[in-house]
């Protein structure tokens, strides 16, 4: 029961984490204009991994994609790669873990196979979480490095944009979402790995007991089975709840009345 709960909780935590990683990757607010000197600004800039946006005091928001690959900083490309790898690994991990869930019975799948799948998905979640945390941390480090380097007509920042003396960038909401989401995915992965230990059949040292029946001699050996061997198929009629988890990823940076791209 505890194993099922740990596995289920690990799956749910990882699912939330991966949804968060996807949300963070799509969000436009990876870096936001530093408002330390001017808390009320008529023009507010913020940038994501894929586009940069400007929200005017009028309420209009204009976002422009980075329509170049070669012109983008290598660090930004690296962050993109880390986040995408994190999402892909997480998605595969989720798919594997659905079939590994103890509460879901698919055909005559053995518990040892479920244990292996649980371990696999757990490792995938851990790597996915680490990728997200690494990506966000690299971007944060890049922001800290560039923070004091924003001077007039210097080509720095996302996509080689001109930085005027007034504009400096600080941590955006996406960074915090990414850190939390990466952490959750990592925790979920660890929980799956812990659950895997409980799912795997342990080798017992019981002595073989022989039962003599008339005409037949059948020996049952309760112990001595390897983890990869199954205990036999489940003949009970169990309902399979295979509801696909739907993630609604609707990210809007800073509510605005007029968004146009």
């Amino acid at each position: 029961m505890a194993v099922t709960a740990c596995q289920g909780l690990g799956f749910v935590v990882s699912l939330i984490g991966i949804a968060g990683i996807i949300a963070a990757t799509c969000m436009d607010q990876w870096s936001t204009q530093d408002l330390y000197n001017n808390p009320v600004t008529a023009v507010f800039n913020y940038q994501g991994l894929w586009r940069s946006c400007v929200r005017e005091s009028s309420g209009f928001t204009e976002c422009r994609g980075y329509f170049t690959l070669l012109g983008l900083p290598a660090m930004l490309q690296a962050v993109r790669a880390l986040m995408i790898v994190g999402i892909v690994l997480g998605a595969i991990g989720l798919l594997v873990s659905i079939f590994a869930l103890k509460c879901i019975r698919i055909g005559s799948m053995e518990d040892s196979a479920k244990a292996n799948m649980t371990l696999t998905s757990g490792i995938m979640f851990i790597v996915s979480g680490l990728c997200a945390i690494a990506g966000v941390s690299v971007f944060a480090n890049m922001l800290v490095t560039n923070f004091w380097m924003s001077t007039a007509n210097m080509y720095t920042g996302m996509g080689g944009m001109v930085q005027t003396v007034q504009t400096r960038y600080t941590f955006g909401a996406a960074l915090f979402v990414g850190w939390v989401a990466g952490g959750l995915t990592l925790i979920g992965g660890v929980m799956m790995c812990i659950a895997c230990r409980g799912l795997a059949p342990e080798e017992t040292n019981y002595k073989a007991v022989s039962y003599h029946a008339s005409g037949h001699s059948v020996a049952y050996k309760p112990g001595g089975f390897k983890a990869s061997t199954g205990f036999g198929s489940n003949t009970k009629n169990k309902k399979i709840y295979d509801g696909g988890a739907r993630t609604e990823d609707e990210v809007q940076s800073y509510p605005s009345k007029h968004d146009y791209v």
Epitope: N38, A42, V43
Partner: antibody
Framework: QVQLVQSGAEVKKPGASVKVSCKAS????????MNWVRQAPGQGLEWMGN????????SYNQKFKGRVTLTIDKSTSTVYMELSSLRSEDTAVYYC???????????WGQGTTVTVSS | DIVMTQSPDSLAVSLGERATMNCKSS????????????LTWYQQKPGQPPKLLIY???TRKSGVPDRFTGSGSGTDFTLTISSLQAEDVAVYYC?????????FGGGTKVEIK
């Protein structure tokens, strides 16, 4: 068509308050910020503040040191500008103006003349 | 606060001739995020509210005649009327739309010579 209709001229004594209204029509009222600009006789334009009818957020010119208060009435699509502790130098034409792309003011009210005299 | 300085104070130009006025800001009005200059030009005729001509330093508002052209970047901006018409006699104001408080220039009065 877009119209911003302001209330009539006002004559006030120093120290009093004045409340000028600006009724908007012909567009989505909550979709555009409303600004207030004043112009003293023979002088240039001076921005006083703005209000976002959607969220109710305001920004003020600190020159007025809290004397200006902007409010809205969504039900009548009207913006109000109240200026307190009036002085003779507050004598001016007060305009409401809708904020557009680039934070520019694309439509203006006809103006309300406020005269402060003892 | 950003200080907007317009020059000249007044300008007398013959009908059909080019009228050029300048606006200088104390800080750059160029926004790094979209590489747009947050400067606006208005025309005000006596007894009337100002009328928007140009925003983002060079984008003409729909309905504004193409003889009005805005140019410049950073701190120096220019409004040019390529061929002055009688109805262009007015005071022209530039405005900082980049940073609060939004500030206006003192205006340039355009007259017919």
């Amino acid at each position: 068509q877009v119209q911003l209709v302001q209330s009539g001229a006002e004559v006030k004594k120093p120290g009093a308050s004045v409340k000028v209204s600006c009724k908007a029509s012909g567009y989505s009222f909550t979709g555009y910020n409303m600004n207030w600009v004043r112009q003293a006789p023979g002088q240039g334009l001076e921005w006083m503040g703005n209000i976002d009818p959607y969220y109710g957020g305001t920004s003020y010119n600190q020159k007025f040191k809290g004397r200006v208060t902007l409010t809205i009435d969504k039900s009548t699509s009207t913006v109000y500008m109240e200026l307190s502790s009036l002085r003779s130098e507050d004598t001016a034409v007060y305009y409401c103006a809708r904020m557009y792309h680039g934070n520019a003011f694309d439509y203006w009210g006809q103006g309300t003349t406020v005269t402060v005299s003892s | 606060d950003i200080v907007m300085t317009q020059s000249p104070d007044s300008l007398a130009v013959s009908l059909g001739e080019r009228a050029t006025m300048n606006c200088k800001s104390s800080q750059s009005l160029l926004n790094s995020g979209n590489l747009k200059n947050y400067l606006t030009w208005y025309q005000q005729k006596p007894g009337q509210p100002p009328k928007l001509l140009i925003y983002w330093a060079s984008t003409r508002k729909s309905g504004v005649p193409d003889r009005f052209t805005g140019s410049g970047s950073g701190t120096d901006f220019t409004l040019t009327i390529s061929s002055l018409q009688a109805e262009d006699v007015a005071v022209y104001y530039c405005q900082n739309d980049y940073s609060y408080p939004l500030t206006f220039g003192g205006g340039t009065k355009v007259e017919i010579k």
